[in-house]
């Protein structure tokens, strides 16, 4: 988790002088509770946005937006703590909006936004906005939390972000797999424009099971430049096992930007449909 290396972060708006500060995620109002605290945020929304760094890289970011409730507690609102928790690693990053002037009611509802938390493809986050000061231990909570699921690199907009491109998202191998005679599979796919090797991983399964009955790995050497974007054709020999008929073919590239952790593409060949055996027709029709 990190903040986009952007120009100075701003939270000021007409009628409010505000500054964005790094936060330890432990505001001192926990330690020094106040008697009067503001109410919780209203209508917290988190959306996927995209932002460029100063270097020109494109990253997915969490766009956080919320409004204030129209009650008198805004007189005691000193700012907000924005917290993003990455579920799988329990990493948390916080920033603090520090209000340098008092809020006043005005003709429209106060609205705040922040779009500088960089998020990772295919990850889940808990976003919390805490109004400051935080409540006394038994006080009503004044935060709102929402979960935010970032799409993976298959998503059209995500595909062109720097982290996805680094993992090989622009390569579309367009895999085709056909079953040949004599227990063979013919795998065909389009090579990328990089002189790097590939691995074909074949895993076979029985009709209705998830435990593999055959595994095979086939190495494809790095293509020459004139072979870039051409189709590569490989014939794999299957083990002659009755019922070991569902085949998953996975192609793993080893691009320089992602090494052994590049996005893989796969195709599956299902077991052949078993025709319903019809009733046998007798050679002659009995007369009785």
């Amino acid at each position: 988790l990190r903040l986009l290396d952007h120009r100075a972060l701003v939270c000021s708006q007409p009628g409010l002088n505000c500054t964005v500060k790094n936060s330890t995620c432990l505001d001192d109002s926990w330690i020094h509770p106040r008697n009067l605290t503001p109410s919780s945020p209203k209508d917290l929304q988190i959306q996927l946005h995209f932002a460029h760094t100063q270097q020109g890289d494109l990253f997915p970011v969490a766009h956080i937006e919320w409004t204030l409730q129209t009650d008198a507690s805004i007189l005691y609102l000193e700012g907000a703590e924005l917290s993003v928790l990455q579920l799988n690693t329990n990493e948390r990053l916080c920033v603090r909006f520090e209000f340098l002037s008092k809020l006043r009611h005005h003709h429209r509802r106060w609205r705040f936004t922040f779009s500088h938390f960089v998020v990772d493809p295919d990850q889940e986050y808990e976003v919390t906005v805490h109004h400051l000061p935080k409540p006394i231990p038994d006080g009503d909570p004044n935060h709102q939390s929402k979960n935010f699921l970032v799409p993976d690199c298959e998503h059209a907009r995500m595909k062109v972000t720097t982290p996805c491109m680094s993992s090989g998202s622009l390569w579309d191998p367009n895999i085709t797999v056909e079953t040949l005679e004599a227990h063979q599979l013919r795998v065909s796919f389009t090579l990328w424009n990089e002189s790097t090797h590939y691995q074909i991983l074949l895993t076979s399964f029985p009709h209705m099971e998830n435990h593999s009955c055959f595994e095979h790995m086939h190495h494809i050497p790095a293509p020459r430049p004139e072979e870039f974007h051409q189709r590569s054709n490989v014939t794999l020999t299957l083990r002659n096992l009755k019922g070991c008929c569902r085949h998953q073919v996975q192609i793993q590239p080893f691009f320089s930007s992602c090494l052994n952790d590049c996005l893989r593409h796969s195709a599956t060949v299902s077991c052949p449909e078993m025709p319903d055996t019809p009733e046998p027709i007798p050679d002659y029709m009995p007369l009785w």
Partner: antibody
């Protein structure tokens, strides 16, 4: 000292219910997601459920989905697992576990035993 | 869902031997993998996270490597106190599945 202590295990008949608790101490409980993990007798570890720090994200293993409910009370530093429609295969030692910042689970309770049997 | 497999399911080695346990994910999980040691009758203990980062307090004879789908836990010189079952766990996305375990004992 960072500590997790589970309680609430016991014997129950198939179809019955139990509520497990996990009391946390020695760390800022409200800053952490929390997990339940179980281990059937003589078997391996099975991840059961996770709840995020503010309860806005909850996930379950397919084997318990629709029967188990994870919850937490940050004011009480407590994690819970409500287990309904219990089956024989739910017999296990249940651990609560705290995730480490960076990944994995670095703090575990001593476990509480749940036995489902008629 | 992503399946986790471990091999071997059990092994016997002599004190001082180099021991290697492998863990494979059915799809790529980047480096979101942890290794645990569980001694009989005890709760599991975290050995390694992020595929190769040693948890503090864990002896340096333990090491982890790998990324994507194939991961390895290595004990460079097996000690009597290393007799245990070792589990890998993926945590790229829920469900945070464990591998079936590898039981290690001394010859």
């Amino acid at each position: 000292e960072v500590q997790l202590v589970e309680s609430g295990g016991g014997s129950v008949q198939p179809g019955g219910s139990l509520r497990l608790s996990c009391a946390a101490s020695g760390f800022t409980f409200s800053s952490y997601s929390m997990n339940w993990v179980r281990q059937a007798p003589g078997k391996g570890l099975e991840w059961v459920s996770i709840i995020s720090s503010r309860s806005s994200i909850i996930h379950y293993a397919d084997s318990v989905k629709g029967r188990f409910t994870i919850s937490r009370d940050n004011a009480k530093n407590s994690l819970y697992l409500q287990m309904n429609s219990l089956r024989d295969e739910d017999t296990a030692v249940y651990y609560c576990a705290r995730p480490k910042v960076g990944g994995g689970m670095d703090v575990w309770g001593q476990g509480t035993t749940v036995t489902v049997s008629s | 869902d992503i399946q986790m497999t471990q091999s071997p399911s059990s092994l016997s080695a002599s004190v001082g031997d180099r021991v290697t346990i492998t863990c494979r994910a059915s799809q790529g999980i980047s480096n979101y993998l942890a290794w645990y040691q569980q001694k009989p009758g005890k709760f599991p203990e975290l050995l390694i996270y992020a595929a190769s980062t040693l948890q503090s307090g864990v002896p340096s004879r333990f090491s982890g490597s790998g990324s994507g789908t194939d991961f390895t836990l290595t004990i460079s010189s097996l000690q009597p106190e290393d007799v245990a079952t070792y589990y890998c766990q993926k945590y790229n996305r829920a469900p945070f599945t464990f591998g079936p375990g590898t039981k290690v004992d001394i010859k």
